[in-house]
Interface confidence: low
């Protein structure tokens, strides 16, 4: 039961090793219950990031020792991951779920590639 | 194993109220929705209410809208149906079932018999 | 409201013989429909999920077919233990919607 999912190509943390992205889903059916996972692949292993489930017209609610944070509108999720180092950098996919009521819908985005490059240490000072 | 047990029915005068219980075991409870169906003497199934796993959305049939009220608390792995303002046509035999959303009902309780009559 | 049309509303037939339940919904529901059996006093009992799969456990002689409005319950050899009566339901959208049911008696 596919449905069409959108999200950036690319992205660059910033120097805190936060990364925020737009997944975009074109809902064909009225949920009221919408699933949100961010998958990360890499090396062809897929894992799960972290998920969250949300009312429509609600926050997003990760669990609290997600690295993920996120907003919802309409059919636009804002997502933000917090943490990253440079070996975190990869493809992060974004997996949207309608999961209520029925019918159900899956869609799955063709990821966006995540740089994370470590600061510099600063140098010691005189 | 899976087990649902309903609990509840009995004999209520037509505008009474009756609260149903089901009781799940053998699964994760809060991951699935849940669904009332009940059936008339000598007649088919009817969708009664369905909730869903975190109790966020709850749907009802036309029939009962607004008497009667779904719930569930994902803490005692309990599914609830309030029914108020009832009358004879909600006398029936009421069926908690595991709801699967698009993959239909996999399992159901027992049922428990509910008599609307004065 | 998605109407569920089932037919026949019953039928007799003998062990060993072929039989087929239909199910036409009033709009596509795609495959989002199953099939139950039920027997007297107890509750009903899953056959066939997303309208062909087969519910584990349940005896291959059972199968189910079809997409969007036109749905069909086939039991290849009728045994003895088959005698129930079969509703399909809709689940693809709310409110649900069973079938008006078919019960398979022994001829």
């Known amino acids: 039961k596919a449905m069409h999912v959108a999200q950036p190509a690319v992205v660059l943390a910033n120097s805190r090793g936060t990364a925020s992205f737009v997944c975009e889903y074109a809902s064909p059916g009225k949920a009221t219950e919408v699933r949100v996972t961010v998958l990360r692949q890499a090396d062809s292993q897929v894992t799960e990031v972290c998920a969250a489930t949300y009312m429509m017209g609600n926050e997003l609610t990760f669990l609290d020792d997600s690295i993920c944070t996120g907003t919802s509108s309409g059919n636009q999720v804002n997502l933000t991951i917090q943490g990253l180092r440079a070996m975190d950098t990869g493809l992060y996919i974004c997996k949207v779920e309608l999961m209520y009521p029925p019918p159900y819908y899956m869609g799955i985005g063709n990821g966006t590639q995540i740089y994370v490059i470590d600061p510099e240490p600063c140098p010691d000072s005189d | 194993e899976v087990q649902l047990v309903e609990s509840g029915g009995g004999l209520v005068q037509p505008g009474g109220s009756l609260r149903l219980s089901c009781a799940a075991s053998g699964f994760t409870f809060s991951n699935y929705a849940m669904s009332w169906v009940r059936q008339a003497p000598g007649k088919g199934l009817e969708w009664v209410s369905a909730i869903s796993g975190g109790g966020l959305s709850t749907y009802y049939a036309d029939s009962v809208k607004g008497r009667f009220t779904i719930s569930r608390d994902n803490s005692k792995n309990t599914l609830y149906l309030q029914m108020n303002s009832l009358r004879a046509e909600d006398t029936a035999v009421y069926y908690c079932a595991k709801d699967l959303l698009w993959l239909g009902f996999d399992y159901w309780g027992q049922g428990t018999l509910v008599t609307v009559s004065s | 409201d998605i109407q569920m049309t089932q037919s026949p509303s019953s039928l007799s037939a003998s062990v060993g013989d072929r039989v087929t339940i239909t199910c036409r919904a009033s709009?596509?529901?795609?495959?989002?429909l199953g099939w139950y059996q039920q027997k007297p006093g107890k509750a009903p009992k899953r056959l066939i999920y997303?309208?062909?799969s087969l519910q584990s456990g349940v005896p291959p002689r059972f199968s189910g077919s079809g997409s969007g409005t036109e749905f069909t319950l086939t039991i290849s050899s009728l045994q003895p233990e088959d005698f129930a009566t079969y509703y399909c339901?809709?689940?693809?959208?709310?409110?649900?919607?069973f079938g008006g049911g078919t019960k398979v008696e022994i001829k």
């Open positions: 339901l809709q689940h693809n959208s709310y409110p649900l919607t």
């Open positions: 709009q596509a529901i795609r495959n989002d």
């Open positions: 997303a309208a062909s």
